[in-house]
């Protein structure tokens, strides 16, 4: 009888440590994404980007999916939400036709089921990039904490997309579930 | 019968509590690291930043270590990192050596095992701080999600360390494990 | 027997589940609280923000309190906290008084057993808002991993209240907790 | 309809100086860069300058650095090319042309002035 | 600064007959930042084609621009009489802004 339950108990222990193994990875979806530099739209409005990487690089991707330049959420919950946005100018890369710019970053949540688009985040600066400097550069960070619901895509939204900078450390988006909904 | 049953039973909650109190503890590892600023090397140039508290006022670690300027990772997994970094400049320092500065911040990883070292995240702006202005200050935030291995090392590097602003609150950096690999 | 002790596994399995649910909710508090720009202070010195949504739009808070404009920490952890805060002008709000600006953040921790504030993180940039140009934007975000004991207060102070941006995607703050104390 | 009018062409002996000027109209002049283009007798084109829409930015070709400055007077919706220490190699027709405003680095060139010639010869 | 290369010089093509210039870079022009333009004898040039593919205003279909990198093609379908002129390249992805030499298409 002993024998048996101490059997038991290992079952209880082993498919405890299974579970809660199993149930905690499944309950920690992420994404880091990076830009894709060689499908950077030009002008300077605000645009929609749609070109990153998601398996190179820093870049990596579990249990979201990236899908038509969105982050689309695949399990309810409250994420940590960031974005890194470095524009940068050179005197070689062209000459700037004005020296006054608007920087930005929108980070937007779309709901499918509700068609909706909402900015969840925003940041940036107007900023004075004078001819007389041969090289300008300038970032936005931007995070916050947000309740996120199966279905629904993350997309960034910026100003000047010509200006942004292409490396996989200046350029990126991401997220991290941190609990469920009660 | 029974009694040896619940005996069990309590072994098994008790263990249980006591495994997922220390699984959970010793899964997420951290680091808030604040500038020490009896060290801060001088020039322009970009340098690597050694000096930082780790059990003083803000700054705390556990199971992290901090040797030779850098966060040393001792456990596999997914973390965020962050760093900010504030400049300032008042003229009651001297005068500015250039109003044309660069200022920037770099977080670096390196692999011991693979003796290499990569930019994970970088932030920053040129600015022009005028003499026309007795006081200047600009702050830089990073953060992003990233796979860490035992072994792999953290470090910043900035531009103009001379700017710096010593305090805790301004320039620090951090880390915590949010989960592991699969 | 055998029967029993399965019931007994069961209640086991069951009586974890709960706990381990409720445990990891409980063990997670969080807020996101964005500006509530009906009681925004006027001036340009530094001032405590103490209107701020919990509870419409992107604005949530769970076990923690938000009370007399402070974010009330209801149970000790290790806690990443953040803030974005948005400043802007526009021609059409009339002249600024100075064209050189200080816009800062401070994010303060108060304890009311040891009756005393600290400030944690700060961030933001001095700037020439010429008028020349007739919008101005800049934003700033901080954030950092702080331990925080049951009864600690966190609040917001700003320079230049008077030209916060009021949208809740551009000036709000926020925490959630990561971690235990060991 | 956006139009550009050129002036200010003429015969100038080696060393000597011109100004050229253009005349815009019929867009919000001061919201867009503008350049000067040249086309040697029988040649080819080649950017000599541009300024942003505010005025603030300047930029020239190598050839003609230090020699030319490029100005404009929003007020007066007129773009101006003042050229001294002229060569027998800047002999060419100057045309004004409008940046499109579209991106923020200066881009392609449309419309385009009709174009003035100077001749600079003993 | 990057060196735009035209070829052919001249082209001799009768109306109705499609024409292919090509216009070559010294280095790849980010963007693709390329525009066309066609000049008639005693006129100022006139846009065609800009980001290597995209019509300007007015600009008939049978005008058609592609390419990226090093190497960016004018096709014009079907050569209407007043087709004929001096076609222009012209790089904007790098500083100086700078043309090709010129493809002259001319009547056969």
């Known amino acids: 009888g002993s024998q048996h339950i101490r059997a038991e108990k290992a079952m209880v222990d082993g498919s405890w440590l299974d579970l809660a193994k199993r149930s905690k990875l499944e309950a920690q979806p992420f994404a880091h994404l990076t830009i894709n530099a060689t499908d950077i739209p030009s002008g300077s409005h605000k645009v929609s980007l749609s070109s990153w990487y998601h398996d190179r690089g820093w870049a990596k991707i579990s249990n979201m999916t990236f899908s038509n330049g969105k982050l689309i959420v695949n399990q309810d919950g409250f994420y940590y939400l960031y974005a890194n946005i470095c524009f940068r100018h050179h005197e070689t890369s062209g000459d700037l036709a004005t020296e006054y710019l608007q920087l930005m970053v929108y980070v937007t949540k779309t709901s499918i089921k509700i068609p909706s688009s909402h900015t969840l985040m925003k940041g940036g600066s107007t900023k004075y990039w004078s001819g007389n400097s041969e090289f300008h550069f300038y970032s936005i960070n931007v995070g916050g904490f947000f309740k996120l619901r199966s279905g629904e895509e993350i997309s960034i939204e910026v100003s000047n997309p010509s200006l942004l900078d292409p490396d996989q450390d200046a350029t990126y988006f991401g997220a991290f579930k941190v609990r469920d909904i009660d | 019968g029974s009694q040896h049953i619940r005996a069990e039973k309590a072994m098994v909650d008790g263990s249980w509590l006591d495994l997922a109190k220390r699984s959970k503890l010793e899964a997420q590892p951290f680091a808030h690291l604040t500038i020490n600023a009896t060290d801060i090397p001088s020039g322009s140039h970009k340098v690597s930043l050694s000096s930082w508290y780790h059990d003083r006022g803000w700054a705390k670690i556990s199971n992290m270590t901090f040797s030779n300027g850098k966060l040393i990772v001792n456990q596999d997994g997914f973390y965020y990192l962050y760093a900010n970094i504030c400049f300032r400049h008042h003229e009651t320092s001297g005068d500015l050596a250039t109003e044309y500065l660069q200022l920037m911040v770099y977080v670096t990883k390196t692999s011991i095992k693979i003796p290499s070292s990569h930019t994970l995240m970088k932030g920053g702006s040129t600015k022009y701080w005028s003499g026309n202005s007795e006081f200047h200050f600009y702050s830089i935030n990073v953060g992003g999600f990233f796979k860490l291995r035992s072994g792999e090392e953290i470090s910043i590097e900035v531009s103009n360390p001379s700017l710096l602003d010593p305090d805790q609150d301004a320039t620090y950096f951090g880390a915590f494990k949010v989960r592991d690999i699969d | 027997g055998s029967q029993h002790i399965r019931a007994e596994k069961a209640m086991v399995d069951g009586s974890w589940l709960d706990l381990a649910k409720r445990s990891k909710l409980e063990a997670q508090p969080f807020a996101h609280l964005t500006i509530n720009a009906t009681d925004i202070p006027s001036g340009s010195h530094k001032v405590s923000l103490s209107s701020w949504y919990h509870d419409r739009g992107w604005a949530k808070i769970s076990n923690m309190t938000f009370s007399n404009g402070k974010l009330i920490v209801n149970q000790d952890g290790f806690y990443y906290l953040y803030a974005n805060i948005c400043f802007r002008h526009h021609e059409t709000s009339g002249d600024l008084a100075t064209e050189y600006l200080q816009l800062m953040v401070y994010v303060t921790k108060t304890s009311i057993k040891i009756p005393s504030s600290h400030t944690l993180m700060k961030g933001g940039s001095t700037k020439y808002w010429s008028g020349n140009s007739e919008f101005h934007f800049y934003s700033i975000n901080v954030g950092g991993f702080f331990k925080l004991r049951s009864g600690e207060e966190i609040s917001i102070e700003v320079s230049n209240p008077s030209l916060l941006d009021p949208d809740q995607d551009a000036t709000y703050f926020g925490a959630f907790k990561v971690r235990d104390i060991d | 309809e956006v139009q550009l009018l050129e002036s200010g062409g003429g015969l100038v002996q080696p060393g000597g100086s011109l100004r050229l000027s253009c005349a815009a109209s019929?867009?919000?002049?001061?919201?867009?860069?503008m350049s000067w283009v040249r086309q040697a007798p029988g040649k080819g084109l080649e950017w000599v300058s541009g300024?942003?829409?505010?005025?603030?930015?300047?930029y020239y070709a190598d050839s003609v650095k230090g020699r030319f400055t490029i100005s404009r007077d929003n007020s007066k919706n007129t773009l101006y090319l003042q050229m001294n220490s002229l060569r027998a190699e800047d002999t060419a027709v100057y045309y004004c042309a409008k940046d499109p405003g579209t991106t923020v680095i200066m881009s392609w060139f449309d419309p385009w002035g009709q174009g003035t010639l100077v001749t600079v010869s003993s | 600064e990057i060196v735009l290369t035209q070829s052919p010089g001249t082209l001799s093509l009768s109306p109705g007959e499609r024409a292919t210039l090509s216009c070559r870079a010294s280095q790849s022009i980010p963007g693709p930042r390329l525009a066309w333009y066609q000049q008639k004898p005693g006129q100022a040039p006139r846009l065609l084609i800009y980001?290597?593919?995209s019509r300007a205003t007015g600009i008939p279909d049978r005008f058609s621009g592609s390419g990226s990198g090093t190497d960016f093609t004018l096709t014009i379908s079907r050569l209407e009489p007043e087709d004929f002129a001096v076609f222009y390249c012209?790089?904007?992805?790098?500083?100086?802004?700078?043309f090709g030499q010129g493809t002259k298409v001319e009547i056969k």
């Open positions: 012209q790089q904007y992805g790098s500083s100086p802004r700078t």
């Open positions: 300024i942003t829409g505010s005025g603030g930015s300047t």
């Open positions: 980001g290597a593919s």
């Open positions: 019929g867009f919000t002049f001061s919201s867009y860069a």
